[in-house]
Amino acid sequence: GSVPPMVNVTRSEASEGNITVTCRASSFYPRNITLTWRQDGVSLSHDTQQWGDVLPDGNGTYQTWVATRICQGEEQRFTCYMEHSGNHSTHPVPSGNSHHHHHHHH
């Protein structure tokens, strides 16, 4: 069977006027997962995103992440898109320093 991922979007200050937004997926199985950033619904190119490897998290499930740098104040234009085992979801960038957690159920 499959285990859906927990998706968590965070933000951190990168440089003046810019922030790095990171989308993390954890506790999922199998390991194949799509995780990518969109701006105004359009996929960002590979050269503007950074990915972590898909790694085992010690519980028989996996974790990974994708990050991109954006202009502060434009957070609402960006969403993280996830596809896993026939399911999909989109996740907004949180305002301020809050985190967004979302678990998926089949």
């Epitope: 194949n32 799509t34 995780l35 590979h46 050269d47 990974t64 896993h84 026939g86 399911n87 999909h88």
Partner: antibody
Framework: QVQLKESGPGLVAPSQSLSITCTVS????????VNWVRQPPGKGLEWLGM???????DYNSALKSRLSISKDNSKSQIFLKMNSLQTDDTARYYC??????????????WGAGTTVTVSS | DIQMTQTTSSLSASLGDRVTISCSAS??????LNWYQQKPDGTVKLLIY???SLHSGVPSRFSGSGSGTDYSLTISNLEPEDIATYYC?????????FGGGTKVEIK
């Protein structure tokens, strides 16, 4: 096994629109992206656009104004519509499943293609 | 758009030969490169993804390498079924773009 099959009109008159259907089996459209690629006679391959599992679309900006990609998950079908065809749109049109895993994005299974000729 | 150039449009080689097909990008593409094989009947198959990863079911005589702007596909021991046109494709920037293709024929 995973299969994709294109079906199109064969012949289209200039200035008319083109509709092609890609019927897939062996995988779910809700969890995979499908791409459209074309190849004019004797030339190379050109990516037209794609539709994601959630129905979101990305297009080649050079053709975006004439292109529309949609799908029907329940029928396992993806649709390509292109408007205002000219003779240089004559090509073999392929649909291909996209695999997008972090640093890896590739078209792992292709249909056989359908030939479209634009002529009066 | 990123231009992908395959300078050799066709080549002839003998069965058993080692064949190398080159591809260059108009700017660095960070190994975001795939290789496809198109048979004379138009059938397209994925061979190599992310520069050097062999797709499942593809014979091990196929290999890929490269970095920056320059990439290559090598067939270590040419077989009759390798008669085809080979295309490189970048996905560093949207839209994904393909090289013009290299047709491999038997001498």
């Amino acid at each position: 096994q995973v299969q994709l099959k294109e079906s199109g009109p064969g012949l289209v008159a200039p200035s008319q629109s083109l509709s092609i259907t890609c019927t897939v089996s062996g995988f779910s459209l809700t969890g995979s992206g499908v791409n459209w690629v074309r190849q004019p006679p004797g030339k190379g391959l050109e990516w037209l656009g794609m539709i994601w599992g959630d129905g979101n679309t990305d297009y080649n900006s050079a053709l975006k104004s004439r292109l529309s990609i949609s799908k029907d998950n329940s029928k396992s079908q993806i649709f390509l519509k292109m408007n205002s065809l000219q003779t240089d749109d004559t090509a073999r049109y392929y649909c291909a499943r996209g695999a997008y895993y972090g640093k890896r994005w590739y078209f792992d299974v292709w249909g056989a293609g359908t030939t479209v000729t634009v002529s009066s | 758009d990123i231009q992908m150039t395959q300078t050799t449009s066709s080549l002839s080689a003998s069965l058993g030969d080692r064949v190398t097909i080159s591809c260059s990008a108009s700017q660095g593409i960070s190994n975001y490169l795939n290789w496809y094989q198109q048979k004379p009947d138009g059938t397209v198959k994925l061979l190599i993804y992310y520069t050097s990863s062999l797709h499942s079911g593809v014979p091990s005589r196929f290999s890929g390498s490269g970095s920056g702007t320059d990439y290559s596909l090598t067939i270590s021991n040419l077989e009759p079924e390798d008669i085809a046109t080979y295309y490189c494709q970048q996905y560093s920037k949207l839209p994904p773009t393909f090289g013009g293709g290299t047709k491999v024929e038997i001498k």
